[in-house]
């Protein structure tokens, strides 16, 4: 085969080798671009820096090598369309620096860097970290910082992320009301900071205030919908990027809603209860205190993350006649009572037949509606106590 | 496999108290209410109670109101039983059970509990 | 108080059948009573045979079966086998608490 002329020339079935001397100023319009998953770059003096635009279109890449070359400056966002990239050479050029953002969201096996006059920073803190832990063949190459010493001595003691405190308030917030968040902000270098409300849909009207190192957040008219719902700070520097989630709970009435009683391996009333705090819960059987046993009890399903209500069942184990009956189910937390009332029937009594009738043996689950109240203001002479903890 | 491992043999002073455990291994321990019996020589077997470990909830025996007390430790799956003021009747082997929607499924070695001046 | 009762002692011989029966004082056994049956062997080694009256526990040979026989729990091994010898307990369910039965002691001669 002829030598190839151009500047970058195929190199196996979807592989590019640019190396004739001088001819690249940028990766702009490389030939295949889409289907690369190899790109070899060697004595660009002119390719300095990298960024976003530059490695657009090249979704496919896996290896990217630009090597004796000018590099001087990798944009924190430059590998942003190459997330499948997984080797990155960028040994003897010029970098001084290199951004955890940079490598941030990347699974990068291997990461090549000897030979560029790094400069000991807190920026490079991610790097020192990398080689601590072994990752991407970092140790081995046994970075050197110019003029400096080994990346490996570097002291870092003053390198951390930025500390964030939110703060939220601690009395009690109600359904409608006007919440303050605050997330104040320390360290060196911050650069950027900001609010993350995916969660929150409907759940208030976000106001949005301040700026580093002090940022404001107010939730307007807030809704029992917020409860469970995280509301994350975020700030960055030079070594990297905190968070932190905080939830405001939103004070609501007890609520309650049972079901019609259900046979699975064993029988279940089924019944799903809200408020905020986690209402008390208790049974009445026939209008009496139901105490629980292993027999009968109270049996939660796993509870949604971000959700208050819970589901669960009254669990019956092989319920005969003398279970049939009215249950009532109570719930009841500082700001209002609720209960609901289901008639259940699990077996017919033995002892109630005609003598000229068969004797019936089949289970026949009654069919009726459950009634939800609606939350009730508390009164202190409702007998309620302490029985089941829903949170 | 559901296996449930208790403490060795007490021997303890009248007056004193002791705790006895019962480590669950093998099956999600908060779901399964847990047994207690007691059985000594002439005696039979006697129902002490029963506790649910995920919420704590407990059932007695009238009889061992304010002498048993049942306590549980979700994060080493361990159930305890506490005596207080511990007297010879209390000498006997004391199992741990698990229920299994009311029915037993697994028993514990027994742990003995001699009580001696 | 409830007394559950139990034969003391039965003696049967190998293959054959072979019924053991729990009663209860405060009138017939029946299917809310929950009866369980324990087996006892030497070293305080309990197994659950069976639970709800004839629920067989997990691994429990299929000789083994549970019903209720007039006004009494039973406990019906077919084809005793020497193996079985031990001490078997019955349990029943009294609305919020267990009473057990004081045992009986089968021999398997």
């Known amino acids: 085969a002829a030598p190839c002329p151009d500047a970058c020339c195929p190199h196996g079935s979807s592989g590019l080798r640019c190396t004739r001397d001088g001819a690249l100023d940028s990766l702009h319009h490389l030939p295949g671009a889409e289907n690369l998953t190899e790109l070899y770059i060697e004595n660009q003096q002119h390719l300095q820096h990298l960024e976003l635009r530059d490695l657009r279109g090249l979704g496919e890449l896996r290896n990217l090598t630009i090597v004796k070359s000018g590099l001087r400056f990798v944009a924190p966002d430059a590998f942003h369309f190459t997330p499948r990239l997984s080797r990155l050479n960028l040994s003897f050029n010029a970098l001084e620096s290199l951004s955890w953002k940079t490598v941030q969201g990347l699974s990068l096996q291997e990461l090549v860097l000897s030979g560029n006059p790094l400069h000991c920073s807190c920026a490079l803190r991610w790097l020192q970290r990398w080689e601590e832990e072994g990752l991407g063949g970092v140790p081995e190459q046994k970075l050197q910082c110019h003029g400096q010493g080994p990346l490996a001595h570097m002291p870092n003691a003053s390198c951390g992320v930025p500390t964030l405190k939110v703060q939220v308030p601690n009395a009690s917030v109600d359904v409608g009301d006007d919440v303050l968040l605050r997330c104040q902000v320390e360290g060196r270098g911050l650069e950027q900071a900001g609010w993350i409300l995916t969660e929150l849909e409907q759940s208030a009207t976000v106001m949005k205030s301040g700026g580093l190192p002090s940022l404001g957040l107010t939730l307007a008219n807030v809704t029992s919908d917020l409860n469970r719902k995280n509301v994350t700070c975020w700030a960055e520097n030079d070594v990297g990027r905190a968070e932190v989630s905080v939830q405001v709970n939103v004070s609501f009435p007890a609520s309650v809603q049972l079901h019609t009683a259900v046979e699975m391996h064993h029988w279940c009333i089924p019944f799903s209860v809200d408020g905020q705090p986690a209402p008390s819960l208790r049974w009445l059987f026939n209008g009496s205190v139901l105490n629980e046993t292993s027999f009968i009890f109270t049996e939660f399903l796993e509870p949604a993350a971000n959700e208050t209500v819970r589901h669960g069942c009254l669990r019956l184990n092989q319920p005969t006649h003398v279970n049939n009956g009215n249950y009532t189910l109570l719930a009841a937390n500082p700001f209002g009572q609720a209960s609901a009332s289901i008639m259940a029937a699990f077996m017919d009594n033995p002892f109630e037949f005609n003598p000229e009738d068969p004797i019936p043996v089949s289970f026949s689950p009654v069919d009726t509606n459950s009634t939800s109240g609606d939350p009730v203001e508390k009164k202190d002479e409702t007998p309620f106590g302490v029985s089941v903890a829903v949170g | 496999q559901v296996q449930l491992q208790q403490s060795g043999a007490e021997l303890m002073k009248p007056g004193a108290s002791v705790k006895i455990s019962c480590k669950a291994i093998?099956?999600?321990?908060?779901?399964?209410?847990i047994e207690w019996v007691k059985q000594r020589p002439g005696h039979g077997l006697e129902w002490i109670g029963e506790?649910?470990?995920?919420?704590?909830?407990?059932n007695y025996n009238e009889n061992f109101k304010g002498k048993a007390t049942f306590t549980v430790d979700i994060s080493s799956t361990t159930t305890y039983i506490q005596f207080s003021s511990l007297t010879s009747e209390d000498s006997a082997v004391y199992y741990c059970?698990?229920?299994?929607?009311?029915?037993?499924?697994?028993w514990g070695q027994g742990t003995s509990l001699t009580v001696s001046s | 108080q409830t007394v559950v009762t139990q034969e003391s002692a039965l003696t049967t011989s190998p293959g054959e059948t072979v019924t053991l029966t729990c009663r209860s004082s405060?009138?017939?056994?029946?299917?809310?009573?929950?009866a369980n049956w324990v087996q006892e062997k030497p070293d305080h080694l309990f197994t659950s045979l069976m639970g709800?009256?004839?629920n067989r526990a997990p691994g429990v040979p299929a000789r083994f079966s549970g019903s209720l026989i007039g006004d009494k729990a039973a406990l019906t091994i077919t084809g005793a086998q020497t193996e079985d010898e031990a001490i078997y307990f019955c349990?029943?369910?009294?609305?919020?608490?267990?009473?057990f039965g004081g045992g009986t002691k089968l021999t398997v001669l």
């Open positions: 059970a698990r229920s299994n929607y009311g029915d037993y499924d697994f």
């Open positions: 093998g099956y999600t321990f908060s779901r399964y209410w």
């Open positions: 506790i649910l470990p995920g919420r704590g909830v407990t």
């Open positions: 405060s009138g017939a056994v029946t299917t809310s009573n929950h």
């Open positions: 709800g009256t004839n």
């Open positions: 349990a029943l369910w009294y609305s919020n608490h267990w009473v």
